[in-house]
């Protein structure tokens, strides 16, 4: 065969600066917990222990490729391709591996393909109970008084960076996108950024290509959607780096426009302002329940 | 060795329908991504569609989405592209070539030697 | 999408020459990038990836280096059987958008 060996393009478990060496990737995936003895027992799965100020982290050095070629893993989750699977295994330090190739399918159709980790997509399977099936990252709420599916999606972080969407709404920001899709239980995908304009016909919105499957939700993916008809997110290319403060950078591929995820305790277009409403005590977000 | 070889071209008026068949051999079909690729006479390289693995998973070039279809059976190791509508620009020699992606990514390593199709009235 | 520009779009050179030829993305692409040659007649043939691997079997003449948006493959001495265009890809994502080519010819 002429198949290349090795990498075919540095999605393996290292960066181009190697192992122990100084590195700068530009999709730098680091636990969040300190890891105190960092050995190959508490960092596997292809993570590097890293120095960080006092302690050590596990870092999961992966540069994923963005095609979509779906695989479901052990854990039931889908992965936008194999790579994502294996950031997964490392980012969570548990093993997941290749069950099928092509989606996690537990019931007939899923969900909206936009989540809130990593700009990832929501768990493949819908959660049954008293709920019915709860879809599109909502959980079941078996304890409120009108059981329900409970949306607790929670879009303050996210800068301004208003999008049209497929309902012909306009929302402040993607991830109000994703808010509305839980509430309403119905898939509801970004068509453009900007506010919609009367030249959007909400007939088109959302249509899909007759060659193209459905895409279920991805899990721990970037979440580039390669159709024409929806912008999700990616992480930002590599000459965006320290473009967020205190944040994460993330690229909306329809548009090819940065938006940034602010740090809990910050907030503007860089993440640069300190939030001081988070020193105060602000009541709880509501829930946000779909009878 | 690895082979994939094309067939299906020919002239065809524009407005027609046209259906390009890719046999492959030597190798594990269902292990590669299999990509359309064309090339219109004197121009550059156009990448056209993907079909990956079960064929669970296509994309197109925005010129042709609607009109061309990509698909794959795997019990044949056979891709297929079903031209519909077609146009005075879609004339071009057709190539197949493979491609794997998994946990990495390559490009085209083997390719066909190409099918012509002439779209003319 | 993603666009791919190359150049020159055409180059002439003398045998024993260095030649370089540079590819640039519209956005990055990490190192997910192909250089392919093809000469007249003929059917595209991989020469590097991963920006900067040599394919297998492809002589050593041929370098490529580069990540994230600009790229370049260098024919360290220009033979005449080198004489074809040369092609950049992208291939992180669909589309999998070529360079529109450089012809490169023997002076």
């Known amino acids: 065969s002429n198949q290349p060996p090795g990498g075919g393009g540095g999605s393996g478990g290292d960066c181009p600066g190697g192992k122990g060496k100084s590195i700068n990737c530009s999709e730098l995936n680091v636990r969040e917990s300190d890891v105190r003895v960092c050995d190959e027992s508490s960092c596997k799965y292809g993570g590097v222990c890293k120095e960080d100020g006092d302690g050590l982290k596990c870092a999961c050095q992966f540069q994923c490729h963005t095609n979509y070629i779906p695989v479901c893993g052990s854990n039931g989750d889908t992965y936008q391709n194999e790579c994502f699977l294996r950031r997964a295994a490392c980012k969570h330090q548990k093993e997941i591996t290749v069950i099928a190739r092509g989606p996690c399918y537990s019931d007939n159709g899923s969900g909206s393909g936009e989540g809130e980790e990593e700009g990832s997509g929501a768990e493949v399977h819908r959660k049954h109970s008293k709920c019915g099936p709860c879809k599109y990252k909502a959980e079941c709420d078996e304890d409120a008084e009108n059981v329900g599916c409970v949306c607790n999606i929670d879009c303050s972080g996210y800068s301004f960076n208003p999008v049209c969407a497929s309902d012909g709404s306009s929302y402040n920001n993607p991830c109000f996108v994703r808010e509305a899709s839980c509430i309403k239980q119905e898939q509801i995908d970004i068509r453009h950024l900007g506010h919609c304009t009367d030249t959007d016909d909400t007939s088109l919105l959302g249509k899909k290509d007759d060659g193209l499957q459905y895409r279920p939700d991805v899990k721990d993916a970037s979440d580039q959607r390669e159709d024409v008809y929806i912008g999700n997110h990616m992480p930002c290319p590599e000459n965006l780096n320290g473009y967020c403060i205190h944040g994460k950078c993330e690229f909306i591929y329809s548009t090819q426009k940065a938006s940034c995820r602010c740090e809990s305790g910050y907030t503007g277009q860089h993440c640069e302002k300190t939030d001081f409403s988070i020193l105060y005590v602000v009541p709880s977000r509501q829930k946000l329940t779909h009878v | 060795q690895v082979q994939l070889v094309e067939s299906g071209g020919g002239v065809v008026q524009p407005g027609r329908s046209l259906r390009l068949s890719c046999a492959a051999s030597g190798f594990t079909f269902t292990t590669y991504g299999m990509h359309w690729v064309r090339q219109a006479p004197g121009k550059g390289l156009e990448w056209v569609a993907v079909v990956w693995f079960e064929g669970n998973s296509k994309f197109y070039i925005d010129s042709v989405k609607g009109r061309f279809i990509i698909s794959r059976d795997n019990s044949k190791n056979t891709l297929f592209l079903q031209m519909n509508s077609l146009r005075a620009e879609d004339t071009a020699v057709y190539y197949c070539?493979?491609?794997?992606?998994?946990?990495?990514?390559?490009?085209?390593?083997?390719w066909g030697q190409g099918t012509l199709v002439t779209v003319s009235s | 999408d993603i666009q791919m520009t190359q150049s020159p779009s055409s180059l002439s050179a003398s045998v024993g020459d260095r030649v370089t030829i540079t590819c640039r993305a519209s956005?990055?692409?990490?190192?997910?990038l192909a250089w392919y040659q093809q000469k007249p007649g003929k059917v595209p043939k991989l020469l590097i990836y991963?920006?900067?691997t040599l394919q297998s079997g492809v002589p050593s003449r041929f370098s490529g280096s580069g990540s994230g948006t600009d790229f370049s493959l260098t024919i360290s001495s220009l033979r005449p059987e080198d004489v074809a265009t040369y092609y950049c890809?992208?291939?992180?994502?669909?589309?999998?958008?070529f360079g529109q080519g450089t012809k490169v010819e023997i002076k």
């Open positions: 890809q992208k291939y992180n994502s669909a589309p999998w958008t």
């Open positions: 956005q990055g692409i990490s190192n997910y």
């Open positions: 991963a920006a900067s």
């Open positions: 070539a493979r491609a794997n992606c998994g946990a990495d990514c390559y490009p085209f390593d083997y």
